[in-house]
């Protein structure tokens, strides 16, 4: 029960995290104009990974995409790459984890397969979260560097009375969304990995013992709640991971087969 809860919670947390990573990647407010010197500006600038925007006091907002690929800073390209890798890994992780969920029955999938899939998705979520955190942190570092550089050159064009004030940029909402989302995805991934340990077969578990009767064979499985009346090769030894779970030797294609609880 605790394993299922951990796995389910890990999935939900990761789902929220990946949704957040996607939202952050699409958001325009990665960097916003610093309003320290002019808190009542009539023109407000903000930038995202894909376009830059200007919001005027009049209410009009104009956004321009970065139509060049080669002309963009390498750091921005790196951040884009990290975020996209994070999204792709997260999406694959979600897909894998759906099939790995203990509460979802898919055919006659063994618990060992579900454990492996849970671990795989967990690792994917961890890497996805790390990619997002790294991407956001690289961008934040870039902002901090540029901020202090522009502060040093704040009034570069002071010729007589004329002042040329450089626009400084500070952290936008997308950075905080990205950090939180990356953290959630990471936590979700760790939870999935923990759940995997609970799902995985342990070598200390008892081997199934077969008792052969003269007429037909009845397999007694310690720790299990099901006794099978087998007519074919349904008596092969199996490890029991969970008493209530259906194992592969309970083949559903036999019409005369019954389960007793």
């Amino acid at each position: 029960m605790a394993v299922t809860a951990c796995q389910g919670l890990g999935f939900v947390v990761s789902l929220i995290g990946i949704a957040g990573i996607i939202a952050a990647t699409c958001m325009d407010q990665w960097s916003t104009q610093d309003l320290y010197n002019n808190p009542v500006t009539a023109v407000f600038n903000y930038q995202g990974l894909w376009r830059s925007c200007v919001r005027e006091s009049s209410g009009f907002t104009e956004c321009r995409g970065y139509f060049t690929l080669l002309g963009l800073p390498a750091m921005l390209q790196a951040v884009r790459a990290l975020m996209i890798v994070g999204i792709v890994l997260g999406a694959i992780g979600l897909l894998v984890s759906i099939f790995a969920l203990k509460c979802i029955r898919i055919g006659s999938m063994e618990d060992s397969a579900k454990a492996n899939m849970t671990l795989t998705s967990g690792i994917m979520f961890i890497v996805s979260g790390l990619c997002a955190i790294a991407g956001v942190s690289v961008f934040a570092n870039m902002l901090v560097t540029n901020f202090w550089m522009s502060t040093a050159n704040m009034y570069t064009g002071m010729g007589g009375m004329v002042q040329t004030v450089q626009t400084r940029y500070t952290f936008g909402a997308a950075l905080f969304v990205g950090w939180v989302a990356g953290g959630l995805t990471l936590i979700g991934g760790v939870m999935m990995c923990i759940a995997c340990r609970g799902l995985a077969p342990e070598e200390t578990n008892y081997k199934a013992v077969s008792y052969h009767a003269s007429g037909h064979s009845v397999a007694y499985k310690p720790g299990g709640f099901k006794a099978s009346t087998g007519f074919g090769s349904n008596t092969k030894n199996k490890k029991i991971y969970d008493g209530g779970a259906r194992t592969e030797d309970e083949v559903q294609s036999y019409p005369s087969k019954h389960d007793y609880v």
């Epitope: 500006t41 009539a42 209410g59």
Partner: antibody, heavy 118, light 113 residues
Framework: EVMLLESGGGLVQPGGSLRLSCAAS????????MSWVRQAPGKRLEWVAT????????YYPDSVKGRFTISRDNAKNTLYLQMNSLRAEDTAVYYC???????????WGQGTLVTVSS | DIVMTQSPDSLAVSLGERATINCKSS????????????LTWYQQKPGQPPKLLIY???TRESGVPDRFSGSGSGTDFTLTISSLQAEDVAVYYC?????????FGGGTKLEIK
């Protein structure tokens, strides 16, 4: 054609109060940030106040801050300017204007004269 | 506050001739975000409210004749009337639309010579 019609101007004593109104028609008033601009006789234009389309932000120059309050009623398509503690230097024709692209004052009313005198 | 200085104070030009009005701001009106200059030009005829001519320093408002053009960047701007018409007699104002408080130039009175 866009119409902005100011009203509420008149003669008032120093220290008195006045409330100007600006009724808008033939344009989507609620989408526009609005401003009040005044012009003293024979003088340059002077910006008085601006309010954002959603009523969330208001801006004033230091000369009127704390004395004037801009507000709007989008349901009634009306802009207001509440003027308190009026001074002789507030005597001017007051225009309401709708802001367009580039923060430019795209639409103007005909103006209403406010005279502050004892 | 950004101070807007217009020159000349008054200008007399013959009909059909070119009229040039200058405007200088104490701070750059160029916004780095969209590379646009937040300078606006207005025309005010006697007894009338101002009328928007040009915004973003060079973008003509719809309905404004193409003889009106704006140019300049940063702190120095120009309004040009390529061929003066009788109906162009008015006072012309430039305005800082970049930062609060919005400020206007002192105006240039344009007359026919």
């Amino acid at each position: 054609e866009v119409m902005l019609l100011e009203s509420g101007g008149g003669l008032v004593q120093p220290g008195g109060s006045l409330r100007l109104s600006c009724a808008a028609s033939e344009f989507t008033f609620s989408n526009y940030a609005m401003s009040w601009v005044r012009q003293a006789p024979g003088k340059r234009l002077e910006w008085v106040a601006t309010i954002s389309s959603g009523r969330s932000s208001t801006y004033y120059p230091d000369s009127v801050k704390g004395r004037f309050t801009i507000s709007r009623d989008n349901a009634k398509n009306t802009l207001y300017l509440q003027m308190n503690s009026l001074r002789a230097e507030d005597t001017a024709v007051y225009y309401c204007a709708g802001l367009g692209r580039g923060n430019a004052m795209e639409y103007w009313g005909q103006g209403t004269l406010v005279t502050v005198s004892s | 506050d950004i101070v807007m200085t217009q020159s000349p104070d008054s200008l007399a030009v013959s009909l059909g001739e070119r009229a040039t009005i200058n405007c200088k701001s104490s701070q750059s009106l160029l916004n780095s975000g969209n590379q646009k200059n937040y300078l606006t030009w207005y025309q005010q005829k006697p007894g009338q409210p101002p009328k928007l001519l040009i915004y973003w320093a060079s973008t003509r408002e719809s309905g404004v004749p193409d003889r009106f053009s704006g140019s300049g960047s940063g702190t120095d701007f120009t309004l040009t009337i390529s061929s003066l018409q009788a109906e162009d007699v008015a006072v012309y104002y430039c305005q800082n639309a970049y930062s609060y408080p919005f400020t206007f130039g002192g105006g240039t009175k344009l007359e026919i010579k």
